[in-house]
Amino acid sequence: KNLKSPQKVEVDIIDDNFILRWNRSDESVGNVTFSFDYQKTGMDNWIKLSGCQNITSTKCNFSSLKLNVYEEIKLRIRAEKENTSSWYEVDSFTPFRKAQIGPPEVHLEAEDKAIVIHISPGTKDSVMWALDGLSFTYSLVIWKNSSGVEERIENIYSRHKIYKLSPETTYCLKVKAALLTSWKIGVYSPVHCIKTTVENELPPPENIEVSVQNQNYVLKWDYTYANMTFQVQWLHAFLKRNPGNHLYKWKQIPDCENVKTTQCVFPQNVFQKGIYLLRVQASDGNNTSFWSEEIKFDTEIQAFLLPPVFNIRSLSDSFHIYIGAPKQSGNTPVIQDYPLIYEIIFWENTSNAERKIIEKKTDVTVPNLKPLTVYCVKARAHTMDEKLNKSSVFSDAVCEKTKPGNTSK
């Protein structure tokens, strides 16, 4: 009896795993084996496909074959017993185009009100994604184990932190990868569940802000309790995309280790130009808080956001204030790349009652002043970009006396 060639051959490629599946064409014939050949583009000869010779099942793995994943290949299969069937040719394909992204590896760390998610590709040093490894983005689905109501989070990187969760609650999530450059969406990871911890009696520090004073950065934060020590760590923001990078490590700011105040001052030259993440942790000697929410810190923006420099022209009932670019060391003005808004505070020298003016212009009139009275003025700059939302520190106060009133009234 003539053997029929197998039919319906499917090629499944997930990461670097190449799997072939097919249907037997004649179930009644026993002890049949199957063999594959492959052919590269531009070649006439067929080569035996290692890993897929004399197979008794209807599945084989040819992952060990070192293929150029961007090069088209063709496969053929035949059945063998005493004699052989005719070859059945599979449509040619390019492995990279056919490949799916496998489930990523996921590691979770629980806090009381947050979960840290570390994601890495399921196949280490994948050949398939060798040119795209840093282009992976991820999306996840998370739900409370008790409710099952799903929340989707798109376009996250290899490390992501979900805040505003409930303590002592089990959350479950699954993650999949995507290569947006190649229009590829991956397979979900298995479901991972983790229980948030009991509430930490020490909350994390809040409202972290960076400002510039002289040649230093001043980092400030709020904290609920007194008599604490704090530590501050930094990380290059771009590393969030690639924790596989050996540089991915939160590092201490030396001048902000074990500080006993809710601020620390460190030289600007600690950081080269770039975008960083900063986080703060509190300790009372026995217990330690979880890390604060991370803030993004752009040295370019911070450096330019120095307090404004201004001149005052005094009249009898008003001040004219002319705002100029702040000076760096060496008295060179800082070039302003960002639109700014100015906050001007003024008060009578003998009083604490402050009044405020907010202006986009660099020449401002402060009206309704009393003649022959000393008024003090200080100013600061704010970025108008909502995303950045940065403020300089206030300039030093400048005090001037108004001119005598017009006596010929």
């Epitope: 840290v116 570390h118 229980k195 009991v198 026995n286």
Partner: antibody, heavy 123, light 107 residues
Framework: QVQLVQSGAEVKKPGASVKVSCKAS????????MNWVRQAPGQGLEWMGK????????HFNQKFRDRVTLTVDKSTSTVYMELSSLRSEDTAVYYC????????????????WGQGTLVTVSS | DIQMTQSPSSLSASVGDRVTITCKSS??????LAWYQQKPGNAPKLLIS???TLESGVPSRFSGSGSGKDYTLTISSLQPEDFATYYC?????????FGQGTKLEIK
């Protein structure tokens, strides 16, 4: 598969130093903390310290801070633990053990252990 | 330093028994707790991390529970190979500290 292979047993005199090695294989050496734990005969486990193989950052148990030195040879994926000013109570089995990924926000459990190195301090 | 107190320090049980070992920390350790099994002449082996997560390859008869300062290791049905010494360890604060161990012996 992950393997940590330690150097052989040592006999030392009081006041001397001992240097134990731990060669790692089967994973990215510079991506995980390496810890050292000791166990005196018939006693429990005691954490000594840990090192980041990528930049040699160290953390120590205060008890050992002045006597222990942790070093790394990245070219051979080996970590060394040197204990100085040995006394008889330092007689113990010394283990290296892999800790969490350096990129983790918090410390992790010790998931792979070396076979241990017995250090005997005796005059 | 955080103190870890394990109880009991020794325990006799039979194959098939359900066994529970407890571990108390002097401070809250936020589930940063591991359980290890050690057999004579061998290095410790990690069984459970994060208080509840079973390491791959560890039989499902082992389970961990607890939160805050109180944690438990349970072996649902003792097997002959489970007779060993068990240690808990906190890794919330440095220095990491271990319990004094629980020796599980055949009755």
């Amino acid at each position: 598969q992950v393997q940590l292979v330690q150097s052989g047993a040592e006999v030392k005199k009081p006041g001397a130093s001992v240097k134990v090695s731990c060669k790692a294989s089967g994973y990215t050496f510079t991506s995980y903390w390496m810890n050292w734990v000791r166990q005196a005969p018939g006693q429990g486990l005691e954490w000594m310290g840990k090192i980041d193989p990528s930049d040699s950052e160290t953390h120590f148990n205060q008890k050992f801070r002045d006597r222990v030195t942790l070093t790394v040879d990245k070219s051979t994926s080996t970590v060394y633990m040197e204990l100085s000013s040995l006394r008889s109570e330092d007689t113990a089995v010394y283990y290296c053990a892999r800790g969490g990924r350096i990129s983790f926000d918090y410390d992790a459990a010790l998931d792979y252990w070396g076979q241990g190195t017995l250090v005997t301090v005796s005059s | 330093d955080i103190q870890m107190t394990q109880s009991p320090s020794s325990l006799s049980a039979s194959v098939g028994d359900r066994v529970t070992i407890t571990c108390k920390s002097s401070e809250v350790i936020y589930n940063r707790l591991a359980w290890y099994q050690q057999k004579p002449g061998n290095a410790p082996k990690l069984l459970i991390s994060g208080a509840t997560t079973l390491e791959s390859g560890v039989p499902s008869r082992f389970s961990g529970s607890g939160s805050g300062k109180d944690y438990t290791l349970t072996i649902s049905s003792l097997q002959p190979e489970d007779f060993a010494t068990y240690y808990c360890q906190q890794y919330w604060n440095k220095p990491f500290t271990f319990g004094q161990g629980t020796k599980l012996e055949i009755k």
